[in-house]
Amino acid sequence: FERTRSLQDPCSNCPAGTFCDNNRNQICSPCPPNSFSSAGGQRTCDICRQCKGVFRTRKECSSTSNAECDCTPGFHCLGAGCSMCEQDCKQGQELTKKGCKDCCFGTFNDQKRGICRPWTNCSLDGKSVLVNGTKERDVVCGPSPADLSPGASSVTPPAPAREPGHSPQ
């Protein structure tokens, strides 16, 4: 089948990084500068993505693969392939349509993106509050109130190794 196809369509022999040049008797020509073809048999090369402004280059364009962008410091990616950069806020804030806004009492945000999350309600799991929450940090739940009888010592929990929320780009 492959042999038959290549006899019928000489373009199928053109590898990634080239295009089938109709102007030159369908021979395989290399992609021009700032263009690429990621699959074989293409009749044109695609223009390389340019990472400008708030975008910065994460991976340079090559003859076989497009450039990849991420965002400059103070911004984060949204959308497939980082199609958009959105501004960061500070921890303890959320980004609204009117800009960064402090978390309301009873909520927190330990990230530079996203919205403020309600504090954990320790009592729902029969526990007590060991460390109060802030705008930047959730409450820390301790043992159940019954376990904290007079004379019982409360143990400070070890610092968390890693807080949820550090999603790789």
């Epitope: 949204l78 959320e94 609204t96 349509k97 978390c103 309301c104 009873g106 909520t107 945000n109 990230q111 993106r113 996203g114 919205i115 403020c116 999350r117 309600p118 504090w119 954990t120 309600n121 320790c122 729902l124 799991d125 959730d138 409450v139 820390v140 739940c141 968390p160 190794a161 890693r162 807080e163 949820p164 929320g165 550090h166 999603s167 790789p168």
Partner: antibody
Amino acid sequence: QVQLVQSGAEVKKPGASVKVSCKASGYSFTGYYMHWVRQAPGQGLEWMGWINPNSGGTNYAQKFQGRVTMTRDTSISTAYMELSRLRSDDTAVYYCAREPGYYGSGLDYWGQGTLVTVSS
Amino acid sequence: SYVLTQPPSVSVAPGETARITCGGDDIGDKRVHWYQKKPDQAPVLVVYEDRYRPSGIPERISGSNSGNTATLTLSRVEAGDEADYYCQVWNSSSDHPGVFGGGTQLIIL
């Protein structure tokens, strides 16, 4: 690659409890909140709650408070959802789903679902 | 608690454009996510934060959100798009942070 694999189907009597597990792989389990969502036959999706696998902190939908308990075992990268005092209208497919790393975005990876049937 | 309202069904011919709405008070101030749900399959996130597509979701699927209505748009609809679609938001209130719409069945004629 990220995978969430749930425990198998369960049949329970009214008044009993069920515990569904969700084993995570392909990412740092303690780095991402885990949510539980259910779908009863012919009904829509219903959010039940979340757990922070790092701290064990939880938040439950008001409807399930007092009946649901979400826990985790970080040594085996597994989250659990236990629902007690089961009723026939708890018959549903229960899903675990991962939050993508910050609150306010969509749930990006889902388990295959666990059918829980409550019948006398 | 916050309520999201979706039409029970939307019908569209192959190749046409389907629009599925999600209504809620000042929903334009929230970030809306959309999931595709097929029978016996887990939900799939198709749009997040109003208008962004995860990797692998085709460009013909898009979202918008303003005022009291968010919209999921599927252009050049195919038979494989037939599914239930759910909108969803997060709240900062502690009694019910996660809210789903009732779902819309997309019917391909």
